[in-house]
């Protein structure tokens, strides 16, 4: 449980006691210079208009200099993703300074306090920086403010405060309560940076979000539409954060962001790419796998600088685990007739052959609904790199897997007993990949049977003309 | 070099309290958590806890929490562990360790405490 | 809580060959693992930390490998020294938990 000051003081003392008396407290905020990969290394605690802990611990004025910034805690300790983080900034950036911001004694309160202490915990990065700057060759451009949760908000207050502009503050998963439509001065914002990228991935439209619902930055990325994070098991936590416990599921779906980003070091020759869209649905849909005018990007570290004129949203699916990448699959079927539908959506799986590998049966999530004469658009994504696509495997279930279904084909069957077989024709499936940006069209293996119904499957070949690329742009980027 | 150095044996009755202090040296204290982790004969190590001596921020393992106290006199680079309520299945062997920077490796240890509940 | 089990729960092995011991966490615990050997009336000490990362003063011939929920500690060429009980740890969330430990002994 949170625990108060003890004898160090409450901040408010602290910033009101006269000088004399302020040298004899503790800085509530601590900076640590990580000079070694090792965890048992103490660091050197840098502090403002000290210069020799910066030449005791080889401070690298020309490199990139990452300041690392937790959030709020219940307890004194640091979490586990700290290390991993910091471990993965040295593996990627060897000469890099990486700095943790340990404002511990102000984020282990209640949440109420802590989100009041972050304005402080941002001035004081914002001095830290200011004097830096006075040092030849420190360029705040080859800053990167990386904060987590309330940290997030953290890096905006600094660098709102700072004299200048940072070169990058990455947001993971920005805290929700007190910061939801909050004014841009309050809360992360893509003026506190040159570049501002954020990663949503305990977002709820219901109950309490823990994470930041709206866009904060000049990216936005929303991986599995920035709720429900694969492998992080129950999703129905609604508890208070101020005075309660955090499960473990909320833990997992909150710091997937932190992981994401980690993922995006550790394994940059197996970069996630992220989609440009105006909403969730329509990233279901499988609408938005473009990369065209700056549409797509790498997510976490990789991520291409994109001043966009106003926020932009990007969405992608992910793994459970690392390492994250999905391959993304627009699929695209034009059902040309429809006989007896009734009340039912069909439910559809696919599977995927290709050179390297074949995929699992995948489910086509019905956003909507099935429309006729009509083309309808999915999207599919498979764990393993499937190399070029071969031939594609649609099935119709058979029998209803939902109580919902059997209800209403119960219903139906009772207005329409002698309801003849349901049907439906597909002479084509187009192909897109997200990744790739290549489009493939297939085409039914024998023309003269294009009709699926349920319990049936119905085979599609590569057509003749292959693969066509139509100048779409590759989702590959420069690595910073 | 690191020591860590606990305070001597106890034998307490059920019912009772019993606090174990850890002093260390060697080290800059208030830069490391401590924490303490207890043996019972013949069984696992159970982690009870840890402090941030820094400021004395605490987690607490649930199984202990409403039993265990972990404080700090940084004055004497001390950490003391409190067990109220003491049960038989309490006797064990209680050590303090040191953690890294992010407190989840032990790479210092005190000696142990030995701390038998009898009535 | 995440629960660490280790195996076998006695390992009997002759001084001279390699020793091999696991550690399998309940769920994924990436690389927050670190395992202690302890002897008779001793503090434990600390072999491995994060899986596979070496401690100063600790024989080479120990080594860690593994992430995620499976591990493995490796004793290349067992000394007199090295019989005892080695425990696992996991770090990656509270409360931090130990395995129940293997017993090494001389065969």
């Known amino acids: 449980s949170p625990v108060p000051f003890g004898p160090e003081g409450r901040l408010e003392d602290k910033l009101h006691k006269p000088k004399a008396t302020q040298t004899e407290v503790k800085p509530s905020v601590r900076f640590n210079l990580r000079t070694s990969k090792d965890p048992e290394h103490e660091g050197c605690y840098l502090s403002v208009g000290h210069s020799q802990p910066l030449e005791d611990c080889s401070f690298n004025m020309t490199a990139k200099t990452f300041f690392i910034i937790h959030g709020w805690t219940m307890s004194g300790i640091f979490e586990n993703w700290l290390h991993k983080l910091v471990s993965a900034l040295h593996t990627r950036e060897k000469d890099a300074n990486v700095v943790v911001v340990d404002w511990l004694p102000l984020a282990h309160q209640l949440y109420t306090d802590a989100v009041n202490n972050t304005r402080v915990v941002g001035h004081s990065i914002a001095r830290m920086l200011d004097w830096l700057q006075e040092k030849d060759d420190f360029s705040l451009g080859n800053v990167h403010l990386i904060g987590y949760s309330l940290g997030a908000h953290v890096a905006g207050y600094a660098g709102n405060f700072v004299k200048g502009t940072v070169g990058r503050i990455t947001g993971l998963d920005p805290a929700g309560p007190m910061f939801e439509g909050a004014d841009i001065h309050k809360r992360l914002s893509p003026d506190d940076a040159d570049f501002v990228d954020v990663l949503h991935t305990y977002t709820r439209s219901f109950g309490l979000s823990i994470g930041i619902q709206m866009p904060v930055g000049h990216i936005d990325i929303y991986p599995n539409g920035g709720d429900f994070q694969p492998g992080c098991g129950l999703n129905d936590v609604l508890g208070s954060i101020a005075y309660g416990t955090i499960t473990e599921v909320v833990k997992c779906e909150h710091e997937r962001a932190v992981h994401l980003f980690v993922d995006s070091l550790v394994n940059q020759d197996k970069p996630s790419f992220a989609f440009q869209c105006t909403d969730s649905n329509r990233f279901k849909k499988g609408i938005c796998l473009s990369c065209r005018k700056n549409r797509c990007n790498s997510i976490g570290y990789n991520a291409k600088k994109m001043r966009n004129k106003r926020n932009s949203k990007m969405y992608l699916k992910t793994r459970a685990g690392m390492p994250f990448r999905v391959y993304h699959y627009q699929m695209k079927i034009h059902v040309f007739s429809y006989k007896n539908m009734g009340e039912i959506e069909p439910t559809f799986y696919v599977t995927l052959y290709g050179t390297n590998a074949d995929s699992q049966t995948l489910p086509l999530e019905i956003v909507e609904r099935i429309e006729q004469n009509a083309t309808n658009t999915f999207l599919v994504y498979t764990e393993e790199d499937l190399g070029d696509l071969l031939k594609i495997q649609l099935t119709w279930e058979g029998a209803s897997q939902s109580w919902y279904n059997l209800w209403k084909e119960f219903r139906s069957y009772l207005s329409q007993p002698r309801n003849p077989g349901r049907e439906l024709n597909i002479r084509r499936i187009r192909v897109k990949s997200g990744e790739t940006q290549r489009k493939l069209t297939f085409c039914t293996e024998d023309p003269e049977n294009t009709s699926i119904s349920p319990g049936r499957e119905l085979w599609f070949r590569k057509c003749r003309d292959g693969w066509r690329m139509k100048n779409e742009t590759s989702p590959t980027v420069e690595l910073p | 070099q690191v020591q860590l150095v606990q305070s001597g044996a106890e034998v307490k009755k059920p019912g009772a309290s019993v606090k174990v202090s850890c002093k260390a040296s060697?080290?800059?204290?208030?830069?490391?958590?401590m924490h303490w982790v207890r043996q019972a004969p013949g069984q696992r190590l159970e982690w009870m806890g840890g402090?941030?001596?820094?400021?004395?921020?605490?987690t607490y393992n649930e199984k202990f929490k409403d039993r265990v106290t972990i404080t700090r006199d940084t004055s004497a680079s001390t950490a003391y562990m409190e067990l109220s309520s003491l049960r038989s299945e309490d006797t064990a062997v209680y050590y303090c360790?040191?953690?890294?920077?992010?407190?989840?490796?032990?790479?210092?240890w005190g000696q142990g405490t030995t701390v038998t509940v009898s009535s | 809580e995440i629960v660490m089990t280790q195996s076998p729960a006695t390992l009997s092995v002759s001084p001279g060959e390699r020793a091999t011991l696991s550690c399998r966490a309940s769920?994924?615990?990436?690389?927050?693992l670190h395992w202690y050997q302890q002897k008779p009336g001793q503090a434990p000490r600390l072999l491995i930390k994060?899986?596979?990362q070496s401690i100063s003063g600790i024989p080479a011939r120990f080594s860690g490998s593994g992430s995620g929920t499976e591990f493995t500690l490796t004793i290349s060429s067992l000394q007199s020294e090295d019989f005892a009980v080695y425990y696992c740890?996991?770090?990656?969330?509270?409360?931090?938990?130990f395995g129940q430990g293997t017993k090494l002994e001389i065969k």
């Open positions: 360790a040191r953690g890294d920077y992010y407190g989840g490796s032990y790479n210092y």
């Open positions: 060697g080290y800059t204290f208030t830069d490391y958590t």
């Open positions: 402090i941030n001596p820094y400021y004395g921020g605490t």
């Open positions: 769920q994924d615990i990436s690389n927050s």
């Open positions: 994060y899986a596979s």
């Open positions: 740890q996991q770090s990656n969330s509270w409360p931090y938990t």
